[in-house]
């Protein structure tokens, strides 16, 4: 019979042949043959494969290291790996939970439309128009641009989102 | 090694006052924004103050607004928390914090303990 070019699901084409991949939480071993089935093992205590493979290696479980603030959410299996998440009042600082922050700053251009809580990160809001910060901050809001009128000075360069308007005298009408 | 160390604690009684220092050993404080958050027995963190890069804003716990004023000197790259009129509740671990406030940048803290 002509050899096989694709194969079914669950399956990888080595050699011509179609072999059974490894279920999750297995390594391969070796590769099946004509007369023998695919040989896989169970990955180690701290190690784990989430997918059917034919990896050789079981990858290791992730370390929540308590030196960055981390500690475990939920323990890895053969089949999946460990959550870390942070100490309480902590935040992550990516979905992937790789470190910890007290909380996060508001960048140029946003202020703190709340303050952080033992629960809640910091949540930041853009500066409307009108409005600026030019930190980066975990309390300041964003400031009003200054009001030139009420100094009696014109505006000379305009305000954004992150710059106060800068004012200047006013030009007089010479007679 | 960078890291903030926090000094000044003690026992001290109600109505007290204290005054809490925090030195940078291994990184500036110059133009970055500082904060004291705190740990009570067995709660969570609190948020006690903050003070900007500038030192030209503030922000203050409304548990601890008009006893307590934070400050800061960069030329001895020091924050300081003076607090009045201590009470029992503000007996707590107090610790600073730098932005970007990552963990590895957390000290000892310094234990306030308020108790007649």
């Known amino acids: 019979p002509e050899p096989p070019t694709a194969c079914r699901e669950k399956q990888y084409l080595i050699n011509s042949q179609c072999c059974s991949l490894c279920q999750p939480g297995q390594k391969l071993v070796s590769d099946c043959t004509e007369f023998t089935e695919t040989e896989c093992l169970p990955c180690g205590e701290s190690e784990f494969l989430d997918t059917w493979n034919r990896e050789t290696h079981c990858h290791q479980h992730k370390y929540c290291d308590p030196n960055l603030g981390l500690r475990v959410q939920q323990k890895g299996t053969s089949e999946t790996d460990t959550i870390c998440t942070c100490e309480e009042g902590w935040h992550c600082t990516s979905e992937a939970c790789e470190s910890c922050v007290l909380h996060r700053s508001c960048s140029p251009g946003f202020g703190v439309k709340q303050i952080a809580t033992g629960v809640s990160d910091t949540i930041c809001e853009p500066c409307p128009v009108g409005f600026f910060s030019n930190v980066s901050s975990a309390f300041e809001k964003c400031h009003p641009w200054t009001s030139c009128e009420t100094k009696d000075l014109v505006v000379q360069q305009a305000g954004t989102n992150k710059t106060d308007v800068v004012c200047g005298p006013q030009d007089r009408l010479r007679a | 090694e960078v890291q903030l160390l926090e000094s000044g604690g003690g026992l001290v009684q109600p109505g007290g006052s204290l005054r809490l220092s925090c030195a940078a050993s291994g990184l500036t404080f110059a133009g970055y924004e500082m904060w004291w958050v705190r740990r009570a027995p067995g709660k969570g963190l609190e948020r006690v103050a903050a003070i900007s890069g500038s030192g030209g804003s503030t922000y203050y716990a409304d548990s601890v607004k008009g006893r307590f004023t934070i400050s800061r000197d960069d030329s001895k790259n020091t924050l300081y928390l003076q607090m009045n009129s201590l009470r029992a509740e503000d007996t707590a671990v107090y610790y600073c914090?730098?932005?970007?406030?990552?963990?590895?940048?957390w000290g000892q803290g310094t234990l306030v303990t308020v108790s007649s």
């Open positions: 914090a730098r932005d970007p406030y990552s963990f590895d940048y």
